[in-house]
Interface confidence: low
């Protein structure tokens, strides 16, 4: 069976939207009006992994682009990157672990924990116009909570 996917946008808990910043980076900033069209639309795929009531394994691809968020070690630190894939082979049910995030729902907010690096989360800075990154702390200065907005296909 083909992998189940849905299209969505994400905003952090400060209502910052995610936009492309160069070919392989996302940044978070406040958008209004027509600028909202800049925000990235994700194709969120529901992939194989350990599931519970509030934890769902997903992969986050960029809609109609062969790019996926992935987590790798760079200079020995877990790092978020946008990785190019062969569109003939992705998305798939058995995604490599670097592409997998545990979508965790808490109080109507979402966290995206790296499956490759437990306790590391997709994060944004308090500051405007800064890169989206993989952070190893929750509840600190950096933001790890998001809301999801569905987008029709």
């Amino acid at each position: 069976a083909p992998v189940r996917s849905l299209n969505c946008t994400l905003r952090d808990s400060q209502q910052k939207s995610l936009v492309m910043s160069g070919p392989y980076e996302l940044k978070a900033l406040h958008l209004q009006g027509q600028d909202m069209e800049q925000q990235v639309v994700f194709s969120m795929s529901f992939v194989q992994g350990e599931e519970s009531n509030d934890k769902i394994p997903v992969a986050l691809g960029l809609k109609e682009k062969n790019l996926y968020l992935s987590c790798v070690l760079k200079d020995d630190k877990p790092t978020l990157q946008l990785e190019s894939v062969d569109p003939k082979n992705y998305p798939k049910k058995k995604m490599e672990k670097r592409f997998v995030f545990n979508k965790i729902e808490i109080n109507n907010k979402l966290e995206f924990e790296s499956a490759q690096f437990p306790n590391w989360y997709i994060s944004t800075s308090q500051a405007e116009n800064m890169p989206v990154f993989l952070g190893g702390t929750k509840g600190g200065q950096d933001i790890t909570d998001f809301t999801m907005q569905f987008v029709s296909s």
Epitope: G49, P57, L73, D76, K77, M95, K97, V100
Partner: antibody, heavy 121, light 112 residues
Framework: DVQLVESGGGLVQPGGSRKLSCAAS????????MHWVRQAPEKGLEWVAY????????YYADTVRGRFTISRDNPKNTLFLQMTSLRSEDTAMYYC??????????????WGQGTSVTVSS | DIVLTQSPASLAVSLGQRATISCRAS??????????MQWYQQKPGQPPKLLIY???NVESGVPARFTGSGSGTVFSLNIHPVEEDDIAMYFC??????????FGAGTKLELK
């Protein structure tokens, strides 16, 4: 060719200390995690400790945590195991092994010949 | 910690026959579709040598007569046909529960 050469073993008194070294060659040492694994005489293998490529992460077996410290010197291509408060049950052949990091799968793909540590009075 | 139970403790086989060594884990070693189980061979006076990783992948340079299989909690190493050079100890190792990597107690392969 990948080569790992351990040194520093020998006879140590109970409660004493010892520092083992592992000299690596034939690969880019600074990009691989490393392990220490030990084997008591006529016994099986026991994983001791792991250190990531840039020393960002260290893991220890419960049996040695707080007594042993794993470290590395990347410019010198050398791995270390500082052992303190040694006990008779630490008597073993100590191997260093390279970690073939693949999708968080801790696999030891190359091993040294080992260095023998005997804890006895 | 995940406990790995190997059986049998020793195994005597004739040259050319099949040797099967089992490794049972106290809990699943599956992680995102991969079985995090390895097999090593150790000859007397030598360090261990990696044979199989992720349950069924044969390490480069290892003869094709070594095969690994299994998933979840039950795994096996098959050697067929057994050659004299295969006489050794064999250990399984799990890497599902990091930071606590564990090995099985080992299986001694002997010639009948």
């Amino acid at each position: 060719d990948v080569q790992l050469v351990e040194s520093g073993g020998g006879l140590v008194q109970p409660g004493g200390s010892r520092k083992l070294s592992c000299a690596a060659s034939g690969f880019t040492f600074s990009t691989f995690g490393m392990h220490w694994v030990r084997q008591a005489p006529e016994k099986g293998l026991e994983w001791v400790a792991y250190i990531s490529s840039g020393s960002y992460t260290t893991y220890y077996a419960d049996t040695v945590r707080g007594r042993f410290t794993i470290s590395r010197d990347n410019p010198k291509n050398t791995l270390f195991l500082q052992m303190t408060s040694l006990r008779s049950e630490d008597t073993a052949m100590y191997y260093c092994a390279r970690d073939d990091y693949d999708v968080s799968n801790y696999v030891m793909d190359y091993w040294g010949q080992g260095t023998s540590v005997t804890v006895s009075s | 910690d995940i406990v790995l139970t190997q059986s049998p403790a020793s195994l005597a086989v004739s040259l050319g026959q099949r040797a099967t060594i089992s490794c049972r884990a106290s809990e699943s070693v599956e992680y995102y579709g991969t079985s995090l189980m390895q097999w090593y061979q150790q000859k007397p006076g030598q360090p261990p040598k990696l044979l199989i990783y992720a349950a069924s992948n044969v390490e480069s340079g290892v003869p094709a007569r070594f095969t690994g299989s299994g998933s979840g909690t039950v795994f096996s190493l098959n050697i067929h046909p057994v050659e004299e050079d295969d006489i050794a100890m064999y250990f399984c190792q799990q890497s599902r529960k990091v930071p606590s990597l564990t090995f099985g107690a080992g299986t001694k392969l002997e010639l009948k």
